[in-house]
């Protein structure tokens, strides 16, 4: 995606400090960067902090040991001030300074935009001795020049507490057009207007857009960067992207795909997870979305049952999570199930239709006509109930369970018994004499266990006392009866 | 962003001196080079001259030598001119201006309107 | 010094006209590294000057392209393709090539 179109005209020679011994001559302007006229003496007064020295580029003339003879100004000389590169060429420049041999331990750092150079560039110092000056060579390389090498770089020495700074060195790095915004991939309604935009930098300045819509350009004048495409409505599909050109040539952004939003297609796999005698919980995986969120979806439940007028339940449901539970249904019951989904443009068709049926449930009513009678002589209750009229959905009868509860003198106690479906009576041990036995039966099935029928109380009197006249629940079972012997 | 912001008008006498500022932000005011322009009223630009804040170094068109003496002060990234002598030829706006990277005077501070006036 | 000779001193233009302003310079504008630092800038009334093109013919960063800049060695131009009204003011060239730096005389751009 990224093509040069050409290289710059000419090359653009480096300028070097000159060599131990050479002369600087040309003056000529800041691109090889004069001092002014006489040196200035490196310990200027800030102009805000009066005791704060200035310490610039030249160290000030210092007295020989023997006193005789003053030594010149330090100073870096003067290099090329400005070099401009294409990127990942590669550069080298540098600083040299001449420095009397009486100076020890010099030591000449590189500083980019002020911040110190460290670590992983390559800094080279060379050293060029004569009998009464050492001619230091500071040189900076940069392979493979990248836009954040772009800056302005500096040399500092570091000599008997000065500190001499160069002038400084511009390095300008040009190469193709960066983003700095690309278009970004996008689902839009049909025939309907929207923007794309892109942007991108050099330098080198002015960077141009031309826009690109399926492999064709969409303007025929480029226009500056950053470039607002605005597209008045597509019909179908469509692959954009942007070329950006300055003069060093073009890059082009990745291509992005503009969707048009459709209705989703419709959900697949429903399935069956778990059902209960008037619950069916379901599962599906969405269908495409059609480029637009889901909003929610519709479960759509037909009973199977011929003899049933064929109406549909809808229940509606959010898109996510993709489950619902069915509830308020039939027991032991056959229904079809789809499911739809809608977006921001309309419904899917609905999925695939699924059979599923309902679990047989609880019984609905109470055994009924339950009669409690002592039979002392035993020393045992009986009980007795006529078969509850159960619907065909509370599925095949397959007991019943008593609960009897004893109470006297602040003590309860509830006991639990559970009889086959044949049976009609039941006998049970007194557990506790001179106290109130209540009794209540409920119909149990494979759905589970129905309702207890109202209580009936007998009282359990002390031993000795003899009555077998029944207490009982009136058919169609009522208030609470108890025998008051 | 670079900003370069001057210190306001000034109304000065004949014979006596002026010292103008010129506050930089939004980058490494020691690595780049500050440009003082004046600017008559309703006449072109004249280029004073130059200061590198990083290490004091400056250059003066001739036209002002004597005229302008340029600083800077890099604890608070400001650079001076100071005018003497000031007659009304000198009456003008000041500008101060950095040299970017592209070898241009890319950012300039709003002017200071300096007076010579008895 | 180099000498920047401008022209013309005024320009009256209609809304949308092009505009075309030239500089001159008494030497060469190339630099011993082969770059010629001939810029052109905008003052608006009551504004610092505005950089729009360096180095003979690159847009600054946020100029509109109706600006183009072209020239070598000593003959400069500034172009404006569509004259808009915001693009009124004075415009200047400037060298940077030798010292001291020196200035066109300016060109007023203003409605006819």
């Known amino acids: 995606a990224i093509t040069e179109a050409r290289e710059e005209a000419k090359p653009y020679p480096l300028f070097p400090g000159p060599l131990p011994g050479s002369l600087q001559t040309d003056h000529t302007s800041l691109l090889s960067l004069p001092h002014t006229s006489g040196y200035q003496p490196a310990l200027m007064f800030s102009p805000t902090q009066p005791g704060r020295p200035y310490t610039g580029n030249v160290a000030i003339p210092r007295v020989t040991s023997a006193g005789s003879k003053l030594l010149p100004p330090l100073a870096f000389k003067h290099t090329v001030g400005h070099i401009i590169l294409s990127e990942h060429k590669d550069v080298k420049f540098n600083c040299s300074i001449s420095v009397p041999n009486i100076y020890q331990d010099t030591t000449i750092s590189w500083w980019k935009d002020g911040k110190e150079l460290l670590g992983a560039h390559h800094a080279i110092t060379q050293f060029y001795p004569d009998d009464e000056v050492t001619a230091i060579i500071a040189s900076f390389s940069i392979t493979s020049v990248q836009r954040s090498d772009n800056g302005s770089y500096i040399c500092k020495m570091k000599i008997n507490n000065e500190e001499i700074v160069s002038d400084p060195i511009y390095i300008e790095v040009q190469g193709l057009p960066h983003f700095t915004k690309q278009p970004e991939s996008m689902n839009v309604t049909r025939n309907t207007a929207f923007n794309l935009t892109c942007q991108a930098v050099g330098p080198p300045e002015p960077v141009n857009i031309f826009w690109v819509q399926n492999s064709s350009r969409v303007n025929e004048q480029p226009e500056k960067s950053p470039s607002v495409l605005t597209v008045p409505g597509l019909t179908e599909m469509a692959v954009f992207s942007c070329e950006a050109h300055n003069d060093k040539g073009l890059t082009v952004s990745k291509g992005v795909q503009i969707n048009i939003k459709a209705i989703p297609s419709p959900p697949t796999e429903v399935s069956i997870h778990n059902s209960t005698a008037h619950s069916i919980l379901i599962s599906w995986v969405p269908g495409f979305d059609g480029y637009s969120p889901f909003r929610n979806c519709s479960v759509q439940v037909k009973e199977v049952d011929p003899l049933s007028n064929g109406s549909v339940m809808i229940f509606n449901t959010s898109a996510s999570p993709h489950m619902y539970q069915i509830k308020q249904l039939q027991a032991l019951a056959n229904y079809s199930i789809g499911v739809s989904c809608m977006n921001e443009i309309g419904w899917s068709a609905v999925s695939p239709w699924i059979l599923a049926s309902t679990t047989e449930g609880a019984p609905s009513v109470a055994p009924l006509n339950v009669t409690v009678f002592l039979n002392e002589s035993r020393d045992n209750v009986d009980i007795r109930w006529m078969k509850p009229l159960t619907k065909r959905q509370a599925g095949e009868l397959v007991g019943y369970r008593i609960s009897h509860v004893w109470q006297s003198a602040g003590i309860s106690k509830e006991l639990l018994e559970e009889v086959g479906q044949n049976n009609s009576r039941a006998q049970i041990s007194v557990q506790v004499h001179n106290a109130t036995c209540t009794v209540r039966i409920a119909a149990v099935t494979k759905g589970g266990v129905g309702p207890f029928s109202d209580p009936v109380k007998i009282f359990i009197p002390a031993h000795g006392w003899v009555d077998h006249a029944p207490s009982s629940t009136p058919a169609p079972g009522n208030a609470d009866p108890v025998l008051i012997i | 962003q670079v900003q370069l912001q001057q210190s306001g008008p000034e109304l000065v006498k004949p014979g006596a001196s002026v010292k103008i500022s010129c506050k930089a932000s939004g980058y490494s005011f020691t690595s780049y080079y500050i440009h003082w322009v004046k600017q008559r009223p309703g006449q072109g630009l004249e280029w004073i001259g130059w200061?590198?804040?990083?290490?004091?170094?400056?250059k003066y068109n001739e036209n002002f030598r004597g005229k302008a003496t340029l600083t800077a002060d890099t604890s608070s990234s400001t650079a001076y001119m100071q005018l003497s002598s000031l007659t009304s030829e000198d009456s003008a706006v000041y500008y101060c201006?950095?040299?970017?990277?592209?070898?241009?005077?890319?950012?300039w501070g709003q002017g200071t309107s300096v007076t010579v006036s008895s | 010094d180099a000498v920047m000779t401008q022209t013309p001193l005024s320009l009256p233009v209609s809304l949308g006209d092009q505009a075309s302003i030239s500089c001159r310079s008494s030497?060469?504008?190339?630099?011993?590294?082969?770059?010629?630092?001939l810029h052109w800038y905008l003052q608006k009334p009551g504004q610092s000057p505005q950089l729009l093109i360096y180095r003979v013919s690159n847009r600054f960063s946020g100029v509109l392209d109706r600006f183009s800049g072209s020239g070598s060695g000593t003959d400069f131009t500034l172009q404006i393709s569509r004259v808009e009204a915001e693009d009124l003011g004075v415009y200047f060239c400037?060298?940077?090539?030798?010292?001291?730096?020196?200035f066109g005389s300016g060109t007023k751009l203003e409605i006819k």
């Open positions: 201006a950095r040299l970017g990277l592209i070898y241009a005077l890319d950012y």
């Open positions: 400037l060298q940077v090539t030798h010292v001291p730096f020196t």
């Open positions: 030497q060469s504008l190339e630099s011993s590294n082969g770059n010629t630092y």
């Open positions: 200061i590198f804040p990083g290490n004091g170094n400056t």
